[in-house]
């Protein structure tokens, strides 16, 4: 009987140009994670893998940094980076459990923009 | 909704081979999981392969009493799934059904708990 349940951040939010922690976590399982897929999408951000390591997708070496653990941190955001992200863990025996995040990244805020200036 | 169509089953002789196809509508969730049962008369319904599809590639998933003889895949394209029966034996007579379910909701394999299912296609192998 497979009872594992996969935990994420769910919705998640951070600056235009900073940086954001995707991080999701199996439990109630004793299965053995064989792999991890980031997805974005349609696209394939990195694969983490229990004998070959981590691989981060080419389009993406630049702004995608493995870790911390199983989890991806992206970097350098964009407002077009706003959307679905998911964590899919490739386990054995239980089988392919997925985990999904909703990222929105905003623009910087007027304060910050604010404070940049000095007011003579 | 989701719908699942099953096509493709019929009668053969032992050692004989069949595939069987689902054709899949309303699935919109962006990962896919898929299942292929079967329930022989007088028996529970027990789970024959399942099939995980993301952009990041395919997982396959085969029961003990069907490895290396079934194999399952998946046409994007056609939006539909198939299940290979090679080698097949007297004991794989029952009706086939084809299931699919959340990603999102547990583990993708054919041990899992499925929420849609086709109405079944028969099969029936004989010695």
């Known amino acids: 009987m497979m009872t594992g349940t996969i935990e994420t951040t769910g919705n998640i939010s951070a600056e235009k140009g900073g940086s954001i922690i995707l991080q999701c976590h199996l439990s109630s399982t004793t299965a053995q994670v064989t792999q991890v897929n980031w997805e974005q999408q349609d696209q394939l951000l990195a694969i983490c893998n229990a004998d070959l390591g981590w691989h981060i997708s080419p389009s993406f070496k630049d702004r995608v940094a493995p870790g911390p653990g199983l989890g991806l941190t992206l970097q350098s955001l964009t407002v077009n980076d706003t959307g679905e992200y998911f964590c899919i863990y490739h386990t054995y025996p239980d089988g392919t459990y997925t985990g999904r995040i909703f990222l929105e990244v905003l623009e910087s805020s007027v304060a910050e923009h604010g404070a940049r200036f000095q007011i003579p | 909704q989701i719908q699942l169509v099953e096509s493709g089953g019929g009668s053969v002789q032992a050692g004989g081979s069949l595939r069987l196809s689902c054709a899949t509508s309303g699935y919109t969730y962006r990962q896919k999981c898929m299942g292929w049962f079967r329930q022989a008369p007088g028996k529970e319904r027990e789970g024959v392969a399942a099939?995980?599809?993301?952009?990041?590639?395919?997982?396959?998933y085969v029961a003990d009493s069907a490895k290396g003889r079934f194999t399952v895949s998946q046409d994007n394209a056609k939006n539909t799934v198939y299940l290979q029966m090679n080698s097949l034996k007297p004991e794989d007579t029952a009706m086939y059904y084809c299931?699919?379910?959340?990603?999102?909701?547990?583990?993708?394999?054919?041990?899992?708990?499925?929420?849609?299912w086709g109405q079944g296609t028969q099969v029936t192998v004989s010695s």
């Open positions: 299931a699919a379910k959340s990603p999102y909701d547990g583990a993708c394999s054919y041990e899992a708990d499925f929420t849609y």
């Open positions: 099939i995980y599809t993301s952009v990041g590639g395919s997982r396959t």
